[in-house]
Interface confidence: low
Amino acid sequence: FSGDGRAIWSKNPNFTPVNESQLFLYDTFPKNFFWGIGTGALQVEGSWKKDGKGPSIWDHFIHTHLKNVSSTNGSSDSYIFLEKDLSALDFIGVSFYQFSISWPRLFPDGIVTVANAKGLQYYSTLLDALVLRNIEPIVTLYHWDLPLALQEKYGGWKNDTIIDIFNDYATYCFQMFGDRVKYWITIHNPYLVAWHGYGTGMHAPGEKGNLAAVYTVGHNLIKAHSKVWHNYNTHFRPHQKGWLSITLGSHWIEPNRSENTMDIFKCQQSMVSVLGWFANPIHGDGDYPEGMRKKLFSVLPIFSEAEKHEMRGTADFFAFSFGPNNFKPLNTMAKMGQNVSLNLREALNWIKLEYNNPRILIAENGWFTDSRVKTEDTTAIYMMKNFLSQVLQAIRLDEIRVFGYTAWSLLDGFEWQDAYTIRRGLFYVDFNSKQKERKPKSSAHYYKQIIRENGFSLKESTPDVQGQFPCDFSWGVTESVLKPESVASSPQFSDPHLYVWNATGNRLLHRVEGVRLKTRPAQCTDFVNIKKQLEMLARMKVTHYRFALDWASVLPTGNLSAVNRQALRYYRCVVSEGLKLGISAMVTLYYPTHAHLGLPEPLLHADGWLNPSTAEAFQAYAGLCFQELGDLVKLWITINEPNRLSDIYNRSGNDTYGAAHNLLVAHALAWRLYDRQFRPSQRGAVSLSLHADWAEPANPYADSHWRAAERFLQFEIAWFAEPLFKTGDYPAAMREYIASKHRRGLSSSALPRLTEAERRLLKGTVDFCALNHFTTRFVMHEQLAGSRYDSDRDIQFLQDITRLSSPTRLAVIPWGVRKLLRWVRRNYGDMDIYITASGIDDQALEDDRLRKYYLGKYLQEVLKAYLIDKVRIKGYYAFKLAEEKSKPRFGFFTSDFKAKSSIQFYNKVISSRGFPFENSSSRCSQTQENTECTVCLFLVQKKPL
């Protein structure tokens, strides 16, 4: 016996969040893994008085304590609809079915005399049917439904007389069913029987407050189990050759402070006081855990030496239950001020360390949904995915000997103190219906797929490719708004006087009269922050730099009456100094953010983008920028993410759609102006960049979710892309969806009607497609009332906790970008596409492994789109150059300009132009390739201020 469970909280220093196998493992379970599903008799059988069944303590408890529940009589009626249960089992394709025998259905008053014939026949028929189907039965003798007569006559499990009576009942079951049953469970989760039956009073028999009774009950349950195990071991195992255990349930807990010894001690105590209470005598040294003996000496019964010897080793495997009943409620004592956690993998590791690596059957696992959820139990899929992933990791990475898994539960039914307010079935049952049809939920389809594949196959992404991007590919980095320096920060050479220092010993400068020196004109490098920008860009080794101008700084009045020439000079310097390093600029004219609209003050006060005249003001501003910078800038973005301004103009859907309309017009006016006036001489290209996350159905088994995913793309991307790239009008699907909600009185929103002139103005006003892509969203359909953009879409988002995610919960889903690029090409034709921002936030200030992982994986998918799908991808701009103070850490540089290690990673990808074959010699000609100019770099770094 090892007892080293507490070591589990000393975290592995090698844990890396970007080794995805530590979050989710695409792998299969061992070859003969035992897949099953379970039910409890009281929960699903119904017929509590039918055919001679006696009442149980729960039948009584329901009538006395759960007044809003008539009885378990409705439930799923498994006693009547046995065939329907068997069909459900067939559907899923399980290897075993774990069910419990109702003690009072066999022996109405609990005492083993002549069994109730109808009850005996029911279980016999069930077992025969399972054997016929090649489904192994795992039979639980006691799942909480003690015959009421034994409670009333003896006081139930408080009285050790029950031990022998239980053994008689077990003997009968072994005799009658043992030829067909190879796996037996004596008692299901004795902790809950004792703690909630006699401590909190939440479970039958509903006694509470007497701690001595709680531990007496626990004591008798352990002795009852042990007696039955010895009985089976001696009299039945030799010829029946089965295995027997007891299902022990537990929560899991994490310390508040992972390095604090006291917190770790409390976590160990927490586990020991719940799981150890029963596991230590049975799987450990035969006695209660030392901590419990010390703490509860006044109420905890004592095992004699002989009893310890008798208890020890009385289980042929470790049957473990991990589900909501052990979490909610978790009594205060068990929580011990630490943090409850659903980390099944760690719980299994604790069992491995504490009980010397036993063979483990997960005898109950799953979560619950609200009773209103019918067959679309999306969150249940993700809970199951998470739990199963943790089990697989435990097997494959931690070498834990889990040999089987019981999904809980086959059917919706009576959920103890929660009665019918929650559902735990993989099959939906309408309790008010006569026929109690078993309808497979999404989770049933999901579990069926898991069983069929014996785990998780990697279907989402294809293997990495080797190859390179074209020689003219833009390798970029994006920055948000650059605030211009109003005055050059470096005034040297502008003062013509000569000074002598410390001439009189007073440590001051003294002007030398009569001497005048030559000054020099202002230079770009007088701007300190340009110097910083250039140093960072040079280290990035990019070919392109995307940054945004500050409209409010360039035109403080919002019109051309007051042009800030110094700001324009500053921006011209950024571009021209970049060009000296071989870095071209992609300039964004307008970059609003959630916190700051970035409009000139007068425009902001005149209703901003709700006012159509803002579009004309934007055209004038764009014209000024084209005129002043266009000789140097060949790639322009008019507006960054206009489709995200809905976050700001969100008072109503009509505000959102009105603002969007004016943004589209503003862009089109600017594009038309460039096309007419500047393109002939400047030969640049103009577009606008759209926020373009991909969307996947949260629940792939629900048609409504597939429709929601497409609807998300329509409302998010097509909303702007359709009018500009294609038709000059809003997407028909989006218009119709909003109109349909309007007709049904669910929304008063309406998309603006476009005139023929407006359609002509908008259509075709892009020279390339610019997409900002960060992540993939998992979407589900949910009908939402209200007249705002967010509710018009009828979409909710789901966070998949098994996915690698950033601190701001951006999921790393590389294959989403490839799907997006294909969708854009399919919908809008074969055009040049730039990914104008793509990146992830990463907490690390130096070794930003998450960002490196993200860049590598996402660029792989972009390369697949280029090489395999033949998408005309022209550039990738990583987001972003430097992080801002107190904002999520998206930067390659910290806010105080310290470089992170992802820069070298990106450098390597850029210099390789992707992911070339080993020894690939496909180099670009000198003119095309951006060779690093060592002298330039030296000058940038050393140029005096």
């Epitope: 939440m202 909610k328 409620p329 205060t332 943090n339 619950f368 307010t421 929650i422």
Partner: antibody, heavy 124, light 109 residues
Framework: QVTLKESGPVLVKPTETLTLTCTVS??????????VSWIRQPPGKALEWLAH???????SYSTSLKSRLTISKDTSKSQVVLTMTNMDPVDTATYYC????????????????WGQGTTVTVSS | SYVLTQPPSVSVAPGQTARITCGGN??????VHWYQQKPGQAPVLVVY???DRPSGIPERFSGSNSGNTATLTISRVEAGDEADYYC???????????FGGGTKLTVLG
Amino acid sequence: QVTLKESGPVLVKPTETLTLTCTVSGFSLNNARVGVSWIRQPPGKALEWLAHIFSNDEKSYSTSLKSRLTISKDTSKSQVVLTMTNMDPVDTATYYCARSVVTGGYYYDGMDVWGQGTTVTVSS
Amino acid sequence: SYVLTQPPSVSVAPGQTARITCGGNNIGSESVHWYQQKPGQAPVLVVYDDSDRPSGIPERFSGSNSGNTATLTISRVEAGDEADYYCQVWDGNSDHVVFGGGTKLTVLG
């Protein structure tokens, strides 16, 4: 739709007994998972819990006011009644009733629905 | 009896994050609930069971609880969040409800 509505006198004289009624709709008072509390708030001051009645009719009272309070319920009328004896001007406050639900546990998961409150002034 | 201590006031600029604390002896082992109360209105439950949000409460409201302090965090604070906030626990030993003294959240500007 779950609602609670408090009713009772607006003005009470010192030494008199205050009787407040909370009428509930949208749920049943004999639901095993529901309890009702009374809370008060003197003008400009914090919330102060007074009493609670559990689904099984068990009652719990604020220690400092226990001797003056009685809480009861009439399930058939969907009403919870609070009486407070020997009223004093310092008892001037807005009195709220609120529902608590156990969603899956031993403890209540907070007071999820409150009445709009009834203001009681104690003055001679 | 169990005592919950809250700071009388917290001020924060719009768009920033507000953190309101609730101190109590080993409060981490209790379930903490948080209420928002605007002038002239009844309290509204914004977080229950330490960190769960009732439906209709924005994701900006979150809670945590460990050791001797529970915290209500309101990210991206809006002017409409200006209100009094109360923490509450059930004292399991006495079956009493305990409220904190309340914190007035002021949104600057």
